[in-house]
């Protein structure tokens, strides 16, 4: 309907216009993670606060069991930040056969699960080598992008090491999505 | 009105539809910060360019005195990048009682001020230890997420050390928000 | 039309309302870069996948020859992540005249080209010194912000060193834009 008149009143028009305020949206914030078993070679998923403080879900966007459930097909902007913290990682010191060793690393993956697909789809990955000498370290990884999702898709955030996630503040580690 | 007809012409409809082009939006860019006094234990706020170059405010989103003023309640996407730069931080050298010393760090906080609340709310925080040996260093911290804001809320960007902010280019350090 | 009735049916209204689903949008993903000549003092541009896997363009947003072509004036959210990877950069070791040498660095720039302007405009820059000792390293730079663009503007992503870009996975290095 861009740049043209509304159709005359005697003609009924099916319009995909919709109020912005009723679009599915969620912003989830970090909670302390309980250690859980996870599949070998699969990064563990974080679970989230969805109601308290800054966290919310609205307009049929629901959070359950580590997943954001997509209630409506469309293009979504999806984002997450995970702040990691750890002790000294003196990865420069130990070398095998004269080669630099494989560095320690931290990784965040935003993953889509579609029930009809056997494999999850990695939508976004942020991965960083960590070679901090001489002190405790902390740093965030931020991700965000737009994806075409289908009703019933599920989103989760996986991390390489759940024990390094900074769960102390809701503004440091978070996960969100909104229909564009 | 999603997926249904417009109401017949004899029936007047109150619709929360609105043109996307009239939504409050702002993109602010860095200017040189003048050293100013700030409260103890509170990170100083950055001030911003709001008109020149890439910067703009529109549709009643106003910038004044380091704050973006929210003109209308709703869900906003808020983002900022701050590029920091500094000199060698040889934090690996000094250890007390065999323990690694507390590292230098850089921090960005996007803060919401609501006049009716006594305390500001930290919406987003990016914080990173800095342990750079042997040369000057520079690096960005990026933040972005969606929040439900109320008319009259004020947003600002606080940093741990205003003297480390790279103010040289409008594309390196910036702050923005838009109503979804 | 916010918060007020639709005009009576006998009055035709020019409305800038439009279906969200028909807005120009694109999400591009990394492909292996072919080494190409680029102008001195100008960072090389990345080329992208625009159809396969997670990548798409829609609603007249077209990708051609390293550029996203803006089909309609308006405010766009633009984002990119580039994951870099490299070998040890022992930039703390070599000093000239007692001064630390200029550090290695990685840089991403999102650039706007307007045919009527002689010079490209740098919209966003993420730049980071790299001083990794003792192992291979990898890390992402993420950028995202809102800009007012004109029909016919072209967007590209430039990097400081194309040989350091991790092109192995579509979730690690990407570029997107959507009309708000």
């Amino acid at each position: 309907l861009k740049g043209q008149e509304f159709a005359p009143s005697h003609q009924q028009v099916y319009a995909p216009l919709r109020a912005d305020g009723d679009k599915p949206r969620a912003h989830l914030t970090v909670v302390r993670q309980t250690p859980t078993q996870h599949f070998k070679n699969q990064f563990p998923a974080l679970h989230w606060e969805h109601e308290l403080g800054l966290a919310f879900t609205k307009n049929r966007m629901n959070y359950t069991n580590k997943f954001l459930l997509i209630p409506e097909s469309g293009d979504y902007f999806i984002y997450s930040q995970v702040t990691f913290r750890g002790m000294t990682s003196e990865c420069s010191e130990i070398r095998q056969a004269g080669r630099p060793n494989k560095p320690d690393s931290i990784t965040v993956v935003i993953t889509k699960v579609t029930d009809s697909y056997p494999e999850p789809t990695q939508l976004l990955m942020g991965t960083k080598s960590v070679c901090e000498v001489g002190s405790n370290w902390f740093q965030p990884i931020y991700l965000g992008a737009m994806f075409s999702l289908q009703e019933g898709d599920k989103l989760m955030v996986n991390v390489s090491d759940i024990s390094l996630v900074d769960y102390t503040k809701e503004d440091k580690t978070f996960f969100g999505a909104f229909l564009l | 009105l999603k997926g249904q007809e417009f109401a017949p012409s004899h029936q007047q409809v109150y619709a929360p539809l609105r043109a996307d082009g009239d939504k409050p939006r702002a993109h602010l860019t860095v200017v040189r910060q003048t050293p100013t006094q700030h409260f103890k234990n509170q990170f100083p706020a950055l001030h911003w360019e709001h008109e020149l170059g890439l910067a703009f405010t529109k549709n009643r989103m106003n910038y004044t005195n380091k704050f973006l003023l929210i003109p209308e309640s709703g869900d906003y996407f808020i983002y900022s990048q701050v590029t920091f730069r500094g000199m060698t931080s040889e934090c690996s050298e000094i250890r007390q009682a065999g323990r690694p010393n507390k590292p230098d760090s850089i921090t960005v906080v996007i803060t919401k001020v609501t006049d009716s609340y006594p305390e500001p709310t930290q919406l987003l925080m990016g914080t990173k230890s800095v342990c750079e040996v042997g040369s000057n260093w520079f690096q960005p911290i990026y933040l972005g997420a969606m929040f439900s804001l109320q008319e009259g809320d004020k947003l600002m960007v606080n940093v741990s050390d205003i003297s480390l902010v790279d103010y040289t280019k409008e594309d390196k350090t910036f702050f923005g928000a838009f109503l979804l | 039309l916010k918060g007020q009735e639709f005009a009576p049916s006998h009055q035709q209204v020019y409305a800038p309302l439009r279906a969200d689903g028909d807005k120009p949008r694109a999400h591009l993903t990394v492909v292996r870069q072919t080494p190409t000549q680029h102008f001195k003092n100008q960072f090389p541009a990345l080329h992208w996948e625009h159809e396969l896997g997670l990548a798409f363009t829609k609603n007249r947003m077209n990708y051609t020859n390293k550029f996203l072509l803006i089909p309609e004036s308006g405010d766009y959210f633009i984002y990119s992540q580039v994951t870099f990877r490299g070998m040890t950069s022992e930039c703390s070791e070599i000093r000239q005249a007692g001064r630390p040498n200029k550090p290695d660095s990685i840089t991403v720039v999102i650039t706007k080209v307007t045919d009527s302007y002689p010079e490209p405009t740098q919209l966003l820059m993420g730049t980071k010194s790299v001083c990794e000792v003792g192992s291979n390293w990898f890390q992402p730079i993420y950028l995202g912000a809102m800009f007012s663009l004109q029909e016919g503007d072209k967007l590209m992503v430039n990097v400081s060193d194309i040989s350091l870009v991790d092109y192995t996975k579509e979730d690690k290095t990407f570029f997107g834009a959507f009309l708000l």
Epitope: - | R32, Q33, T34, P35, T36, Q37, H38, K40, R85, G86, M87, D161, I162, S163, L164, V165, Y167, T168 | -
Partner: antibody, heavy 117, light 107 residues
Framework: ELQLQESGPGLVKPSETLSLTCAVS????????WAWIRQPPGKGLEWIGD???????SYNPSLKSRVTVSVDTSKNQFSLKLSSVTAADTAVYYC???????????WGQGTLVTVSS | DIQMTQSPATLSLSPGERATLSCRAS??????LAWYQQKPGQAPRLLIY???RRATGIPARFSGSGSGTDFTLTISSLQSEDFAVYYC?????????FGQGTKVEIK
Amino acid sequence: ELQLQESGPGLVKPSETLSLTCAVSGISFNDFHWAWIRQPPGKGLEWIGDINHRGHTSYNPSLKSRVTVSVDTSKNQFSLKLSSVTAADTAVYYCARDYPNFTFDLWGQGTLVTVSS
Amino acid sequence: DIQMTQSPATLSLSPGERATLSCRASQSVSTYLAWYQQKPGQAPRLLIYGASRRATGIPARFSGSGSGTDFTLTISSLQSEDFAVYYCQQYGDTPLTFGQGTKVEIK
């Protein structure tokens, strides 16, 4: 090599205008602010003011009415003009790079300007 | 303007000794304080910024501490090349101001 080099007359008459130029080499001129600082003989340091490549300036209020700092990016240099000088303006004048912000990590060698008739 | 007061005016010490220089601001400057070293006939040299961050290439024997109004520069073991005048500078407010200097001389 990173270098800042002041130049200008070493003697200025009272009530006239002191003019100095600082040439910057080996550094990205656009990435920093550039400052003037002076030091009267046997005394401490006084910040005069600074400028960036876009011509944005800030000045010490005590000197603001008499000071102009300007920039010529094509030559990678910036200049100081101090009007209506008196004997109290006799000093070694330094140009310096403002880095990290509001501190000065690279300095010229300084040039002594004497105000005398 | 914020006034910066350094003490003592002169410090007489022997090589190998520890030097402690003080700088006081007339009002709080948070940690926005720098220290410089100046030798006769030379330009000042940045030693410390941010009250405690060593500038590039500065030896570890130089350290800074303090916040608010009271700051200290410590030279853990004086070397012959350390005998010079030391200035503090605040950048917590404009105009930027310097102290009057402390001379560290050989006893």
